[in-house]
């Protein structure tokens, strides 16, 4: 239910793509430490033919959960641009039923301070691995729309 606007690519290339590339550039070092396990989000949400809008809508919604996760203001500003910009360009008429957003990571049982610190670091890395992949998939999906590819 998304009437994708800006298919000529002007808004995407001048705003969204710039922010996506800035974000990805700042996450260059993330990747080598990421686990191979597939994230549930990407099992369920695919930028498939005729479902690009649905994917981008949910990806933008997911991005909003990462706001304020990173300390730098620029990072948050670019995240906001990508999330809000994608939602605006999608122009989705049918809103997905609103529920409380899920937490980024699962709550961990009480552990020693050392273990907790390690778990928190692992969780943060996991979140950053997910965020990097999410941004890559959003970029790929927008490019797919703008190239007009309707691959099944």
């Amino acid at each position: 239910d998304c009437d994708i606007e800006g298919k000529d690519g002007k808004q995407y290339e001048s705003v969204l793509m710039v922010s996506i590339d800035q974000l990805l550039d700042s996450m260059k070092e993330i990747g080598s430490n990421c686990l191979n396990n597939e994230f549930n989000f990407f099992k369920r949400h695919i930028c498939d033919a005729n479902k690009e809008g649905m994917f981008l809508f949910r990806a933008a919604r997911k991005l909003r959960q990462f706001l304020k996760m990173n300390s730098t203001g620029d990072f948050d500003l670019h995240l906001l641009k990508v999330s809000e910009g994608t939602t605006i360009l999608l122009n989705c008429t049918g809103q997905v039923k609103g529920r409380k957003p899920a937490a980024l990571g699962e709550a961990q049982p009480t552990k020693s301070l050392e273990e907790n610190k390690s778990l928190k670091e692992q969780k943060k890395l996991n979140d950053l691995c997910f965020l990097k992949r999410l941004l890559q998939e959003i970029k790929t999906c927008w490019n797919k729309i703008l190239m007009g590819t309707k691959e099944h």
């Epitope: 191979n36 597939e38 369920r44 957003p101």
Partner: antibody, heavy 117, light 111 residues
């Protein structure tokens, strides 16, 4: 258009092994998760395993000790290695491409595996 | 594992009838605002065909007489006006949790 073609089925004795293949065409193979699902004669559907774009796998715990899913992106082919086969493994085995919502969006025609002495 | 209970297991109907099939999950298949329930049609000797994904989304190329609804544990597949080609077996499937599980099927026969 998307095409999935299974092969490798046939009659096999209990305790033996078999490797099923699924040749894919009509889409960018490496960009999609893939599944194996089976259906015993006159029965319902049963999910066996999935393999994702990065090569990570998920199994139905019931089969994880005997079945192994793998893929070769250079050959656009999905595999299912089945060991220690039993009579109750007799079924039509389908490969399927992952779809939105982790559905099975496209299916092969199936290959029949009969385990019998 | 999430158990999927479909009802009825079989039904007889005539062309033009409105048909409703229900599927009940042993626990919720909802996550992050979406319901992970899919519906398939299978004809004898053929592979299943995806009809509805994520509870209510019609798969491309599937006639609009098919619709899905529900959330949490209770879901429905409706065929608004049964056509001759709709006589088949229908399966629900949850994808919220591994292992992915199917309902036992509902066979729709000609009355």
């Amino acid at each position: 258009q998307v095409q999935l073609v299974e092969s490798g089925g046939g009659v096999v004795q209990p305790g033996r092994s078999l490797r099923l293949s699924c040749a894919a065409s009509g889409f960018t193979f490496s960009s999609y998760g893939l599944h194996w699902v089976r259906q015993a004669p006159g029965k319902g559907l049963e999910w066996l395993a999935a393999i994702w774009t990065g090569g990570s796998t998920d199994y139905n715990a019931e089969f994880s000790s005997r079945f192994t899913i793998s893929r070769d992106n250079s050959k656009n082919t999905l595999y299912l290695q089945m060991n220690s086969l039993r009579a109750e493994d007799t079924a039509v085995y389908y490969c399927a491409r992952n779809g939105y919502g982790e559905s099975f969006a496209y299916w092969g025609q199936g290959t029949l595996v009969t385990v019998s002495s | 594992d999430i158990q999927m209970t479909q009802s009825p297991s079989s039904l007889s109907a005539s062309v033009g009838d409105r048909v409703t099939i229900t599927c009940k999950a042993s626990h919720s298949v909802d996550d992050d605002g979406d319901s992970y329930m899919n519906w398939y049609q299978q004809k004898p000797g053929k592979a299943p065909k995806l009809l509805i994904y994520m509870a209510s989304n019609l798969e491309s190329g599937v006639p609009a007489r098919f619709s899905g609804s529900g959330s949490g544990t209770d879901f429905t597949l409706t065929i608004s006006s049964l056509q001759p080609e709709d006589f088949a077996t229908y399966y629900c499937q949850q994808s919220n949790e591994d292992p992915l599980t199917f309902g036992g099927g509902t066979k729709v026969e000609i009355k």
